[in-house]
């Protein structure tokens, strides 16, 4: 049969950050091509990445339709140049992915401190509300729009002259913290979804310190 040298895809893996979602698999194709299908548990299969020699497929457009749904994908293998050929059972070879629920599993991207402003002994630190590819009414939603109060930020802040990191938390994108007058502080933030058991935390934002250009000081 024409599928003698066709091998099924394996190691199907979801790679997803802030809902940008790519399915990856192995092996690199030799004389074969792949097509991916994706479906919700109760929905119909939709084909993507037709007859590709890539070993990844961007499924963001599909999963952002409803990030709380659970998705399943499958990767079909076809002989190169003979995509009509099927396996011995009359079906092309395919492998299923693990199930994937974007809302529960997408990784949280590295946050960014947008600004900080000192007024006397208080500092207001603002975290950038990153835009996602999730849409509602033709507009892209921010991470906060999607997760609401499920998403919190932890602020680590410390005197430039000391090593101990104090923490503050918010379920908005703003912190208001007390600082000692005349001291310079550094800041880093982490996104957290406390209700999760996996992929709970982002990596830390780049550190920003007072005396650098993102900050503003007012008496």
């Amino acid at each position: 049969s024409g599928t003698t040298n066709t091998v099924a895809a394996y190691n199907l893996t979801w790679k997803s950050t802030n809902f940008k979602t790519i399915l990856e698999w192995e092996p690199k194709p030799v004389n074969q091509v792949y097509t991916v299908q994706i479906s919700t548990k109760s929905g119909d299969w939709k084909s993507k990445c037709f007859y590709t020699t890539d070993t990844e497929c961007d499924l963001t457009d599909e999963i952002v339709k409803d990030v709380k749904q659970t998705y399943l994908a499958r990767v079909f293998s076809y002989p190169a140049g003979n995509v009509e050929s099927t396996g011995s059972a009359g079906e092309p070879l395919y492998e299923n992915s693990p199930e994937f629920t974007p809302y529960l599993e997408t990784n949280l991207g590295q946050p960014t401190i947008q600004s900080f402003e000192q007024v006397g002994t208080k500092v207001n630190v603002t975290v950038e509300d990153e835009r996602t590819l999730v849409r509602r009414n033709n507009t892209f939603l921010s991470l906060r729009d999607v997760f609401g109060k499920d998403l919190i930020y932890t602020l680590y802040y410390w005197k430039s002259s000391s090593s101990g990191k104090k923490t503050a938390k918010t379920n908005t994108n703003e912190f208001l913290i007390d600082v000692d007058k005349g001291e310079n502080y550094c800041f880093s933030v982490q996104a957290v979804i406390p209700s999760r058991t996996v992929n709970r935390k982002s990596t830390d934002s780049p550190v920003e310190c007072m005396g650098q250009e993102k900050g503003e000081f007012r008496e």
């Epitope: 919190i152 680590y156 503050a168 982490q190 935390k201």
Partner: antibody
């Protein structure tokens, strides 16, 4: 099942050192914050310090700063409290606790505690 | 550091009594207050978080409330297993601080 188990307590002379361990199971310490809290005999709870194992950040109570060090080994899923220059007033049951890192950050799981006695 | 002033330090009550314990924060801590129960020789157990939310598995006779910087733990009908020491804790800012504790004893 989430569990924290402390070990390493015992009798130590003033000025001595001790290392306590907090072994976690049922969750990954790398995505939580781990605190150490102590309780002197017949007294209330006193916070000692925390570590965020994801970045190594720590903070300590003034009473232990410079003497105690918290660390974590995520491959062993264990946090540690290294206690140096111990004093009689460090005598206490030492607990580790998990911080769920929500906005109010309650300590949702605690270990059973390990007794440290500093005495000559 | 934020001080959490807890009162009373001890109280005597009977089974079925309504018991109220209060904690006052020395400055604003929003709702970042938890309440714990501790029995002799045991680790503390979380009862209430975010000032008024009942932790999973905790009986509904326990409740928490907030009025400004004053926080209250109420046991609506004291049960034999509720005789213990109770602590409030703020974690609005580092370092987190505990109240001095309230020992609930049998009258």
């Amino acid at each position: 099942e989430v569990q924290l188990v402390e070990s390493g307590g015992g009798l130590v002379q003033p000025g001595g050192s001790l290392r306590l361990a907090c072994a976690a199971s049922g969750f990954t310490i790398g995505v939580y914050i781990i605190h150490w809290v102590r309780q002197a005999p017949g007294k209330g709870l006193e916070w000692v310090g925390y570590i965020d194992p994801s970045n190594g950040y720590t903070y300590y109570a003034d009473s232990v700063k410079g003497r105690f060090t918290i660390s974590a080994d995520t491959s062993k899923n264990t946090a540690y409290l290294q206690m140096n220059s111990l004093r009689a007033e460090d005598t206490a049951v030492y607990y580790c606790a998990r911080d769920d890192q929500s906005v109010s950050s309650p300590f949702d799981y605690w270990g059973q505690g390990t007794l440290v006695t500093v005495s000559s | 550091d934020i001080q959490m002033t807890q009162s009373p330090s001890s109280l005597s009550a009977s089974v079925g009594d309504r018991v109220t314990i209060t904690c006052r924060a020395s400055q604003d801590v929003n709702t970042a207050v938890a309440w714990y129960q501790q029995k002799p020789g045991k680790a503390p157990k979380l009862l209430i978080y975010s000032a008024s939310f009942l932790y999973s598995g905790v009986p509904s006779r326990f409740s928490g409330s907030r009025s400004g910087t004053d926080f209250t733990l109420t046991i609506s009908s004291l049960q034999p297993e509720d005789f213990a020491t109770y602590y409030c804790q703020q974690h609005y800012t580092t370092p987190p601080t505990f109240g001095q504790g309230t020992k609930v004893e049998i009258k």
